[in-house]
Interface confidence: low
């Protein structure tokens, strides 16, 4: 009897859906693996007799529950299937958005870029999938612990009347209010304000 794959899980970020597993702990031979997905009541092969311990399911529909399964094989023998259920739109991790920050006197002007979706049109982003998509922004004076958070209404935001000649750090995450779901924070971007004199328009 071939032991089944262990630690089977879906690693999904921005709808790049990678089913991952580990070779059975005490397998003393080189196993191969087959991974399948349920389509209209019939299981279809996605990765067949692969020596890898992962399989890319990014082409799955983003909506609805999917049943995936994987088994280990050796020669004419095989293990039992290990099943998992996965709903991309609910389960995928929202990766960090992009952010552009520009200093204009005592203001920080920020523009946010929703993460791109894998295996989709070049312009397709997470914002196209989630109707409620918005951003959480947090900012703080560099070197202090006190963080302030805002929820911009648009893909851009301006923090005005900041202290001049002071370094502020900003980071952003995706936020889905209707799902109460937050994404990963972007790396902080730190910029120094200049004077508080009026900037000519």
């Amino acid at each position: 009897m071939v032991p089944p794959p262990e630690n089977v899980r879906m690693n999904s970020v921005n709808f790049k859906n990678i089913l991952q597993w580990e070779s059975p702990a005490f397998a003393k031979r080189n196993l191969t693996f087959t991974a399948q997905y349920l389509s209209y009541r019939i299981f279809q092969d996605k990765c067949t007799s692969t020596t890898l311990t992962e399989c890319d399911f990014s082409s799955l529909s983003k909506y609805g529950d999917h049943t995936l399964r994987v088994r280990a094989e050796f020669a004419d023998e095989h293990s039992d299937w290990v099943n998992i259920t996965f709903c991309p739109v609910d389960d995928t991790i929202i990766g960090p958005p992009g952010m552009q920050v520009e200093v204009l006197a005592d203001s920080l002007h920020m523009r946010f870029l929703a993460p791109k979706i894998e295996n989709e049109y070049e312009t397709w982003t997470m914002k196209n999938v989630y109707n409620s998509w918005t951003y959480n922004v947090q900012y703080w004076k560099n070197g202090t612990d006190e963080k302030f958070q805002i929820t911009p209404q648009y893909d851009f935001e301006v923090l005005r009347n900041l202290e001049p000649w002071t370094t502020y750090c900003v980071q952003v995450q995706g936020f889905l209010p209707d799902r109460n779901k937050t994404g990963e924070w972007s790396e902080p971007v730190c910029e120094k304000t200049t004077s508080d004199e009026t900037v000519p328009s």
Partner: nanobody, 123 residues
Framework: QVQLVESGGGLVQSGGSLRLSCVAS????????IGWFRQAPGKEREGVAC??????????NYIDSVRGRFTISRDNAKNTVYLQMNKLKPDDTAIYYC??????????????WGQGTQVTVSS
Amino acid sequence: QVQLVESGGGLVQSGGSLRLSCVASGFTSPYSTIGWFRQAPGKEREGVACISSSGRGVNANYIDSVRGRFTISRDNAKNTVYLQMNKLKPDDTAIYYCATNCWRLTSPAADNWGQGTQVTVSS
């Protein structure tokens, strides 16, 4: 250190209205979110409404059970946030807390909390 003081709670009949106020002192930025959470007897604390006042206007979030009945607003000049509660129901009975950095209403992971004000709705 930010300090938050709530007021305006009380006993009201079902269908009635109350207006809660929260005055923030030591509050250093009008950009920070501020809002209201509540805790009913024997239940976990939950977010009610949260407001951010940003460089491009105001954005408010509400939990579904109060949307359309409660309105959150803020007056940055007075460092005060308000919760206008209309069409109150017995289910709204709870201690209402003011809190900063409240943007995620599903978890009471705000940074600073007031002492709370009791709201009781009788049927």
